[in-house]
């Protein structure tokens, strides 16, 4: 009686059970009551990366560097090209399709955390005692000066983008 | 059981074309690629090209490149094999066959190129 | 590709074992398990007896065995028999989907 079921790495075809191509290799021609299934490997830059019945390899992803991407990881017959962003840039969406350029954080912003291939600048506001004077995609918020460790009295407050201006302390006359 | 039945003998002149086809029965007919081979007469097996029915894709010898096409016709379960620009020389018996591994053969298609 | 090279003749007499070579380059043989041999009589066409390298079809007879070192593979058939007697060719995948062949080897049972 011909199955209705293939066992795990199997497909029915023709009311029998054939082996699936192993990741790196295509179909070319199902399994007979004679032979066994007929697979290929891939060929140069092609891949795929599961037990499959394919007919065609998929082609490795292209890096285009006009997009500003660059090769992270080369592909083989079993996997595809991971590719990420130049420095100073990271991918727009988890396949890493193109990439933008980092983001800098605002005056009265400082950086929590750097920006990488595949995530943006995270950027958050400078607390009380804290400030950021500059555009900046690496500089974190600075802790105002302390005027009392240097023997200086505060002259100006400081802002979130601004640091406090320390001056002499008034002599008793 | 795959079967693959192919056309009658051919008598061509030098420069014409001749194609030849390859009726499959038995199996899935989208689920193998098909080879061609060819046998001049006393000599050797020599692989022409392949045709693969699930998406018509084709790769041909380099030898023949240019000559030859491979066509399928799904809705007959039938390919093709067209060669071009025939010369003497291609006097032969011309096989199709499952797959790269070529388990299953047809029974030839001579094909006599003279003037 | 240029052919796969193989002996033109080979013999034996019934019951011995004879032994086909079939020498490629690291491009085909050397660089795949894809070798198959075929059997071919006079006026027939020709027959998978051995795929994969070592792999035989089913219905055809363990006396038929064959292996690979390197860039040759090889094709041994013990116990002859008189309707040994043929054309016998090898084949190697020799990528991009390309396929190359033997030259063919004629067995001769003797006797």
């Known amino acids: 009686e011909p199955p209705t079921a293939c066992r795990e790495k199997q497909y029915l075809i023709n009311s029998q059970c054939c082996s699936l191509c192993q990741p790196g290799q295509k179909l070319v021609s199902d399994c007979t009551e004679f032979t066994e299934t007929e697979c290929l490997p891939c060929g140069e830059s092609e891949f795929l990366d599961t037990w499959n019945r394919e007919t065609h390899c998929h082609q490795h992803k292209y890096c285009d560097p006009n997009l500003g991407l660059r090769v992270q990881q080369k592909g083989t017959s079993e996997t595809d090209t991971i590719c990420t962003c130049e420095e100073g840039w990271h991918c727009t969406s988890e396949a890493c399709e193109s990439c933008v350029l980092h983001r800098s954080c605002s005056p009265g912003f400082g950086v929590k955390q750097i920006a990488t291939g595949v995530s943006d600048t995270i950027c958050e506001p400078c607390p009380v005692g804290f400030f950021s004077n500059v555009s900046s995609a690496f500089e974190k918020c600075h802790p105002w000066t302390s005027c009392e460790t240097k023997d200086l009295v505060v002259q100006q407050a400081g802002t979130n983008k601004t640091d406090v201006v320390c001056g002499p302390q008034d002599r008793l006359r | 059981q795959v079967q693959l039945v192919q056309s009658g003998a051919e008598v061509k002149k030098p420069g014409s074309s001749v194609k030849v086809s390859c009726k499959a029965s038995g199996g899935t007919f989208s689920s193998y690629a098909v080879s061609w081979v060819r046998q001049a007469p006393g000599q050797g097996l020599e692989w022409m090209g392949m045709?693969?029915?699930?998406?018509?894709?084709?790769s041909y010898a380099q030898k023949f490149q240019g000559r030859v096409t491979m066509t399928r016709d799904t809705s007959t379960s039938t390919v093709y094999m067209e060669l071009s620009s025939l010369r003497p020389e291609d006097t032969a018996v011309y096989y199709c066959?499952?797959?790269?591994?070529?388990?299953?053969w047809g029974q030839g298609t001579l094909v006599t190129v003279s003037s | 590709q240029s052919a796969l090279t193989q002996p033109p003749s080979a013999s034996g007499s019934p019951g011995q074992s004879v032994t086909i070579s079939c020498t490629g380059t690291?491009?085909?043989?050397?660089?795949?398990?894809?070798v198959s041999w075929y059997q071919q009589h006079p006026g027939n066409a020709p027959k998978l007896i051995i795929y994969d390298v070592r792999k035989r079809p089913r219905g055809i007879p363990d006396r038929f065995s064959a292996s690979k070192s390197g860039n040759t593979a090889s094709l041994t058939v013990s116990g002859l028999q008189a309707d040994d007697e043929a054309d016998y060719y090898c084949s190697s995948y020799a990528g991009n989907n390309n396929l190359v062949f033997g030259g063919g080897t004629k067995l001769t049972v003797l006797g």
């Open positions: 045709i693969n029915p699930s998406g018509g894709t084709t």
């Open positions: 066959a499952r797959g790269f591994r070529m388990d299953q």
């Open positions: 690291s491009s085909d043989v050397g660089a795949y398990n894809f």
